[in-house]
Interface confidence: low
């Protein structure tokens, strides 16, 4: 909508907004619309909720068409019913250290996420929860048959992760980057965010990327073979173009999407990477947005809405991202 022209308000009366969502005037001061919420895509026509201190963050000047609703600098966070100040770090449980930054919470695991392969002194490693201990620990089962030790050693590799990666310490800055959050939409285009200080000034900043776990129109259950319960990564049928608020990706992509599980488990991205995607809008404007691309998916029981607010949140995050 061109704000210099007459107002164009297609609906009378105003739309009804979900509970907790403000009814606001659009960016042209013309039409009443439901305000976009934290992490949602926004445009001049789709403003962010001002009553929650949100603004439309467009990123680079070249992307002034579509942004992401972001909390103003210094906005607090509400996490697990507690309000935290921006910049404040807290332990959500014994397993996670979290930081609030301008309304967004980023968390890092305190427990080692290492993979332990067989070694001469521990040919059969197994992770167990020990009484009185927060983190699961590796224990070594005695082999029932000593002859299997030899083949097991072929895979021996030391993977201790007890301290920060030395490559992540630079110029008096301990670089910390949280995992990417789960995609804001279970189907269709959504947003994923993370918090990092991996920048020249070592300052915490929020990063966001577009994400699509699966297209909404795909009827994935049809593809599950008889007797099977899950299709983790359906075969890519054909190259597609991504759509974003009326703008179309300039290239086609042979993207992987996550499938579905019929046994009550959730199927979410497990390993992902982030790549820039250029979108061309109807008026000819081109904008570049970072987007998540899925490498592998995993089926698990830590579904959105599970009881442990953080466990379900964390295990839905993306691992192994190369961006």
């Amino acid at each position: 909508q061109n704000c210099s022209g007459p107002c164009r308000c297609p609906d009378e009366p105003a739309p009804r907004c979900p509970a907790g969502v403000s009814l606001v005037l659009d960016g042209c001061g013309c039409c009443r619309v439901c305000a976009k919420q934290l992490g949602e895509l926004c445009t001049e026509r789709d403003p962010c909720d001002p009553h929650k201190g949100l603004f439309c963050h467009f990123g680079s000047p070249a992307n002034r068409k579509i942004g992401v609703c972001t909390a103003k600098d210094g906005a607090p966070c509400i996490f697990g019913g507690t309000v935290y100040r921006s910049g404040e770090s807290f332990q959500s449980s014994c397993k996670y250290q979290c930081t609030c930054l301008d309304g967004a919470v980023g968390c890092m695991p305190l427990c080692s996420m290492d993979v332990r392969l067989p070694s001469p002194d521990c040919p059969f490693p197994r992770r167990v929860k020990l009484p009185g201990k927060c983190c699961e620990e590796w224990v070594c089962d005695e082999p029932k048959d000593q002859t299997v030790v030899g083949p097991a050693l072929a895979a021996y590799r030391l993977e201790d992760t007890f301290g920060p990666d030395p490559t992540m310490i630079r110029a008096n800055c301990l670089v910390q980057t949280t995992e990417w959050s789960a995609c804001s939409k279970t189907c269709g285009m959504g947003i994923s965010t993370r918090v990092t200080n991996d920048n020249a000034s070592c300052r915490l900043e929020k990063q966001s990327r577009l994400c699509m776990v699966r297209p909404c129109e795909a009827d994935l259950e049809e593809n599950i073979k008889k007797g099977k319960k899950c299709i983790r990564t359906p075969k890519i049928s054909k190259p597609i173009k991504f759509e974003l608020s009326g703008c179309t990706s300039m290239k086609t992509y042979r993207a992987k999407f996550c499938g579905v599980c019929t046994d009550g488990r959730c199927c979410t991205p497990h390993r992902t990477t982030t790549l820039p995607v250029e979108f061309k809008c109807p008026d000819g404007e081109v904008m570049k947005k970072n987007m998540m691309f899925i490498k592998t998916c995993a089926c698990h029981y830590n579904c959105p809405g599970d009881n442990d607010i953080f466990e379900s949140l964390y295990y839905r995050k993306m691992y192994g991202d190369m961006a």
Partner: antibody
Framework: QVQLKQSGPGLVQPSQSLSITCTVS????????VHWIRQSPGKGLEWLGV???????DYNAAFMSRLSITKDNSRSHVFFKMTSLQTDDSAIYYC????????WGQGTTLTVSS | QAVVTQESALTTSPGGTVILTCRSS?????????ANWVQEKPDHLFTGLIG???NRAPGVPVRFSGSLIGDKAALTITGAQAEDDAMYFC?????????FGGGTKVTVL
């Protein structure tokens, strides 16, 4: 009660123009916009354009060059004019009130034929 | 120009519930598409049911409700009646123009 009444010709020759007047009652043209839509067997419902309550207009890009919508608020008239008619413009033309297209005119059946 | 897609036909029984959907070819339908639903009865009698995604037009029975389901707009008829046997069109707004869907014929058997 809210009503939209259309008046206009039924038969027009190719290359000629179509003019329809939509007279509204029960509401003000300064409060609601008025849309124009046509229905033809081959194409279903086609949105043609709108004149908004404040006088601005928007048109279907496919008809932009030959469509004009104006209004007279005081007389509660909305005027629709389409030029350079061809046989495939034969259809039923409707005016409808903005706000969910809640009220429609009775329709003007147009046949473009020589 | 965007293409708006609807189911061609749906059948329900009296008292049943039927959900009609409206999909946009250029991405998810949002509140900014101001989804409208229009009913057509025989003899080209049109009535607007829903405007602005979920606002019922004056005099429209409460059994008609509009919403967004996933990336589509939806019209739900809860407790269908014989007089709901009709053609239903959705229309989506794209910043400067509306596009109508092809319509869904609802049969109440």
């Amino acid at each position: 009660q809210v009503q939209l009444k259309q008046s206009g010709p039924g038969l027009v020759q190719p290359s000629q123009s179509l003019s329809i007047t939509c007279t509204v009652s029960g509401f003000s043209l300064t409060t609601f916009g008025v849309h124009w839509i046509r229905q033809s067997p081959g194409k279903g419902l086609e949105w043609l354009g709108v004149i908004w309550r404040r006088g601005g207009t928007d048109y279907n890009a496919a008809f932009m060059s030959r469509l004009s919508i104006t209004k007279d608020n005081s007389r509660s008239h909305v005027f629709f004019k389409m030029t350079s008619l061809q046989t495939d413009d034969s259809a039923i033309y409707y005016c409808a009130r903005d706000g969910g297209f809640d009220y429609w005119g009775q329709g003007t059946t147009l046949t473009v034929s020589s | 120009q965007a293409v708006v897609t609807q189911e061609s036909a749906l059948t329900t029984s009296p008292g049943g519930t039927v959900i009609l959907t409206c999909r946009s070819s250029i991405g998810a339908v949002t509140t900014s598409n101001y989804a409208n639903w229009v009913q057509e009865k025989p003899d080209h009698l049109f009535t607007g049911l829903i405007g602005g995604t979920s606002n019922r037009a004056p005099g429209v029975p409460v059994r008609f409700s509009g919403s967004l389901i996933g990336d589509k707009a939806a019209l739900t008829i809860t407790g269908a009646q014989a007089e709901d046997d009709a053609m239903y069109f959705c229309a989506l707004w794209y910043s400067t123009h509306y596009v109508f869907g092809g319509g869904t014929k609802v049969t109440v058997l």
